[in-house]
């Protein structure tokens, strides 16, 4: 059997690090046995079978110039085998980032904080930590770890399914190559990554009668799950056509009227979803609507739909401590917003 | 020579923008994480932002967040700092820093001095 | 984020002192622990390297120790050139984050 540990890599391949001494190893010859070496396609004998050294070559402070196919001899001139020298570095440890779109999955994603110029793999898994009791800062025993499935196609992504919101994760990267590995541990809050997708479907309608009126109506992100305890709050911008500022509300549900739209000018309308209770961050903005209000006279009936708006809410601190979760309460696509509206409008 | 030379700094009115520099040279600059570390007048110094050797991932400390955007053009071994809605704290020398991997800085520029004041 | 703090915040010594400069974290952050020295006017320069490795080039008389939580860095013989602020910097977290840095001045 060769001498010569296989690393992890391609047969045939030995590694090294720039500056380092470097030893290669005859695959072919007995542990021990002595070798000459030379550079493949070059007469010039490198280190001869008296070198004391047996089957091995030592490069002392190897530099680039080194890399390449080497060639190993026995004392009777059968060729003991070929090696390809690659120099490169170890491992450094990789950049993590992890994020969630709902409340029961993440997905972890990574990049190599200094390229090694090697072969390279990513081991991935996570472990479950949870918290002994509201008060307490103890944590039961990890459970786990379990791999973190990576995506096919090779990409720098790993999800974990079936997560619980209320639980902390610690994930598990390591980056491999043949000189080594090195591991980022990042622990992760669901509560703290989480984001949601944007809210889907916005359309713009006018009022008719109403000629500083918009309705704008939305739906939830196809990602979130349909659960009646985890539901979504909402911000709602707006601007006239050329004008640079945009307007912001707090919608209750999943409609709004705009009450103080520009008579005759289009409007840019967009909405941002977020965990009701503030856990995580705002999602990004939905593509933006556009719709201009109506023109004409007012009818006699006031219509009752959407909150009416005339300056814009506080935005909620982010860091906000959560208040506890209500055990149940309705879906937001079970409500009917404009039951619950205040039956009252201002005229345009 | 290995350096790093920063450039872009000045001075600017509050709620304004900047963009900084980093031009890096005497190394391989697409094999390594860099970094924006500032130092106002004084004062010690404080992690900005860093970003990976691909460009696909970036970190920002709380107090730039939302503000301030970092950058690499590989092709050109250079590192950007995008600086908006600049506030009177942001005044600080700011230093390009190197890596080894993610955190360590074997490598400084020597800084540009960036003012915001009205 | 993760808090450093170093003690003494600055200190006076004669040349040929051993001088001992402590550094804590707020949590473990194992030998991810770095130490860089400052010269007025100057960039930082990296001397330690994860808690206990000298940086390529740095004099053997700088040295660190240390893990955990708690690190020391050490001076073994301060020279006149050592005139500096000296400041940790953890790196276990992604965001790093500095000590206050500790000043150094010959006596």
């Known amino acids: 059997s060769s001498p010569c540990p296989q690393a992890w890599g391609p047969p045939g391949v030995q590694y090294g690090q720039p500056g380092r001494s470097v030893k290669l190893c005859c695959p072919g010859v007995t542990a021990g046995d002595p070798v000459s070496w030379f550079r493949d396609g070059e007469p010039k004998l490198l280190q001869g079978p008296d070198s004391g050294l047996g089957h091995e070559l030592v490069l002392a402070q190897a530099d680039s110039t080194d890399e390449g196919t080497y060639i190993c001899q026995t004392l009777d001139g059968a060729l003991g085998g070929t090696v390809t020298l690659q120099l490169g570095y170890p491992p450094a440890r990789p950049v993590v980032s992890c994020q969630a779109a709902d409340y029961e999955n993440f997905s972890c994603t990574w990049s190599p904080s200094q390229i090694s110029g090697l072969p390279t793999r990513y081991l991935t898994s996570y472990r479950k930590k949870t918290v002994l009791g509201a008060d307490s800062q103890r944590r039961s025993p990890s459970t786990g770890p379990w791999p973190c499935p990576q995506d096919p196609l090779g990409a720098a992504r790993c999800v974990v399914h079936g997560a619980e919101f209320w639980s902390q994760y610690r994930i598990n990267v390591t980056e491999v190559n043949p000189l080594g590995a090195s591991t980022r541990l990042l622990d992760v809050s669901l509560q703290s990554i989480l984001r949601p997708d944007p809210p889907q479907g916005l359309r713009v309608e006018s009022v008719p009668g109403y000629p500083r009126r918009l309705r704008a109506s939305w739906t939830y992100p196809a990602s979130w799950p349909c659960q009646p305890h985890f539901l979504l709050k909402f911000r709602l911008q707006y601007r006239p056509a050329q004008h640079p500022a945009w307007s912001t509300v707090e919608p209750a549900g999943l409609e709004e009227v705009i009450t103080d739209a520009v008579a005759g000018l289009p409007h840019a309308v967009r909405v941002s979803a977020r965990d009701f209770l503030d856990a995580g961050t705002w999602s990004t903005w939905s593509p933006e609507a556009w719709g201009t209000p109506s023109t004409g006279t007012i009818p006699k009936e006031i219509p009752a739909w959407g909150q009416l708006h005339t300056q814009p809410e506080v935005e909620p601190q982010v860091d906000s401590p959560a208040p506890p979760r209500p055990s149940l309460q309705p879906h937001p696509r079970l409500l009917d917003h404009r039951d619950s509206v205040e039956q009252v409008a201002v005229l345009a | 020579e290995v350096q790093l030379l920063e450039s872009g700094g000045g001075l600017v009115q509050p709620g304004g923008s900047l963009r900084l520099s980093c031009a890096a040279s005497g190394f391989t600059f697409s094999f390594y994480s860099m970094t924006w570390v500032r130092q106002a007048p004084g004062k010690g110094l404080e992690w900005v932002s860093s970003?990976?050797?691909?460009?696909?991932?970036?970190q920002y400390a709380d107090s730039v967040k939302g503000r301030f955007t970092i950058s690499r053009d590989n092709s050109k071994n250079t590192l950007y700092l995008q600086m908006n809605s600049l506030r009177a704290e942001d005044t600080a020398v700011y230093y390009c820093a190197k890596g080894p991997g993610w955190g360590s800085f074997d490598l400084w520029g020597r800084g540009t001095l960036v003012t915001v004041s009205s | 984020d993760i808090q450093m703090t170093q003690s003494p915040s600055s200190l006076s010594a004669s040349v040929g002192d051993r001088v001992t400069i402590t550094c804590q974290a707020s949590?473990?952050?194992?030998?991810?622990l770095n130490w860089y020295q400052q010269k007025p006017g100057k960039a930082p320069k990296l001397l330690i390297y994860?808690?206990?490795n000298l940086q390529t080039g740095v004099p053997s008389r700088f040295s660190g120790s240390g893990s955990g939580t708690d690190f020391t860095f050490t001076i073994s013989s301060l020279q006149p050139e050592d005139i500096a602020t000296y400041y940790c910097?953890?790196?276990?977290?992604?965001?790093?984050?500095f000590g206050p840095g500790t000043k150094v001045d010959i006596k």
């Open positions: 970003i990976v050797p691909y460009g696909d991932l970036t």
């Open positions: 949590q473990d952050i194992n030998n991810y």
């Open positions: 910097q953890q790196h276990e977290s992604q965001s790093p984050t």
């Open positions: 994860d808690a206990s």
